[in-house]
């Protein structure tokens, strides 16, 4: 080994070197949180880039660049360091017009903490391993969600558009003539029934066990879906989103109540099956795989 390489190895394995890099990263993160950084922080920025460059040079001199098994670029953690340095020099010395997008990559510096702290490295390693192992579970999850989304599409397509519409039309008024004149939400409230404090018109249905309209109102299927049009089973993609919402239990009881009011109470069976299979079984299966991957990584 050349003297330069010997010195590089000594620096690299020294605990103070790791401490210096860790402190640099943390200080860099603190500086990145500043809203309006003063002018002198520019020089500090150069210092950080210098330290990172020095760290990478030490690693390259000690281990070699890319030829050989244990060289610098053969370690995925060093790819991050390399990208950080490349972007640091790119944003500083190359005129690329609007560099605000490139400046975003400075955030990657915070990720360098992972490669320095051993505990974090284990966790992230486990996370990456679990993602690899999750592929089969993810395929199963997407398949199950797709199947139930298709069932939901068939059962509830258009149902959430049902609204309670005022019965008392003038002599030559039609639903279309009214809809053409409606502009503001206030206009809608004149013709459609709204519960107090509700943003959407009262849902209703045409089956005997679905929600009925109050006296003087009739159930029509018109206008947009609830929640600004985001809650529906009208297309496969919206149905899939609704099913994902059920699986993650994200305010799912509202979707459940809306759908049951529009379609009928019988359809609670659909929701029971989805919650049991999607929310209780699949979610826990995902957690089990992650736990297994973490256990393997620890061993």
């Amino acid at each position: 080994f050349s003297p330069l390489r010997r010195i590089s190895i000594k620096i690299l394995v020294h605990s103070l070197f790791s401490m210096l890099i860790m402190c640099t990263i943390l200080t860099n993160c603190i500086f990145m949180t500043m809203n309006n950084p003063p002018d002198w922080t520019k020089n500090v920025e150069y210092t950080f880039t210098g330290i990172y460059t020095f760290e990478s040079l030490v690693k390259i001199l000690a281990r070699g660049f890319c030829v050989g098994e244990f060289t610098f670029l053969r370690d995925p953690w060093n790819w991050l360091d390399f990208v950080v340095i490349v972007f640091a020099y790119l944003t500083e010395f190359v005129n690329l017009g609007n560099v605000s997008a490139l400046r975003t990559f400075r955030v990657l510096r915070a990720l360098k903490t992972i490669s320095v702290i051993p505990g974090l490295k284990t966790i992230v390693g486990a996370l990456i391993q679990s993602v690899k192992k999750l592929s089969d579970v993810m395929i199963l999850t997407v398949f199950c969600l797709s199947v139930f989304a298709l069932i939901g599409l068939q059962l509830f397509m258009g149902n959430l558009k049902h609204k309670c519409f005022r019965n008392s039309l003038e002599n030559n008024e039609t639903l279309e003539s009214i809809m053409n004149t409606l502009e503001s939400e206030e206009d809608f409230r004149k013709y459609f029934y709204y519960l107090e404090g509700s943003k959407d018109a009262l849902l209703c249905g045409f089956s005997t066990d679905s929600g009925q309209c109050p006296e003087g109102y009739t159930c029509v299927k018109i206008g947009r879906n609830p929640d600004y049009g985001y809650t529906s089973f009208d297309t496969f993609s919206w149905a899939f989103l609704a099913l994902f919402r059920l699986m993650t239990q994200d305010y799912w009881e509202n979707l459940y109540q809306q759908t049951l009011r529009a379609a009928g109470k019988t359809y609670m069976i659909f929701f029971v099956v989805v919650i049991f299979l999607g929310s209780f079984y699949l979610i826990n299966l995902i957690l089990a795989v992650v736990a297994m991957a973490y256990e393997e990584q620890n061993q």
Epitope: G158, K161, F165, N167, L169, T174, L175, E176, F206, E215, T218, C219, V220, K221, I222
Partner: nanobody, 120 residues
Amino acid sequence: EVQLVESGGGLVQPGGSLRLSCVASGGIININYIAWYRQTPGKQRDLVARISSDDTIKYGDSVKGRFAMSRDKVKNMVHLQMNSLTTEDTGVYVCSALITPWTGDTRTYWGRGTLVTVSS
């Protein structure tokens, strides 16, 4: 496809009676209301009678007390019994219904109309 078909029109003498029928067919989930309109040349369509889903019936001012509307919910059908007809009642009687079909949104459907001529 939802269709409205009227029948029962024809020539009748003043003071006579006529019974019009309108049947809705196709993929129907719900009928919110069915109405009869009278279309006369050079004039707009005037409401004759309208029956809502809750069986509330509204009559036009010119026919009150003379015309009677009834509904057969099972057959998706309405009847308009016209009594004491006058020459003023002459026109094309068009059936209209606010229907929710299996596919698509609730909208107003119109029939082609049936001609009623009151003349001596």
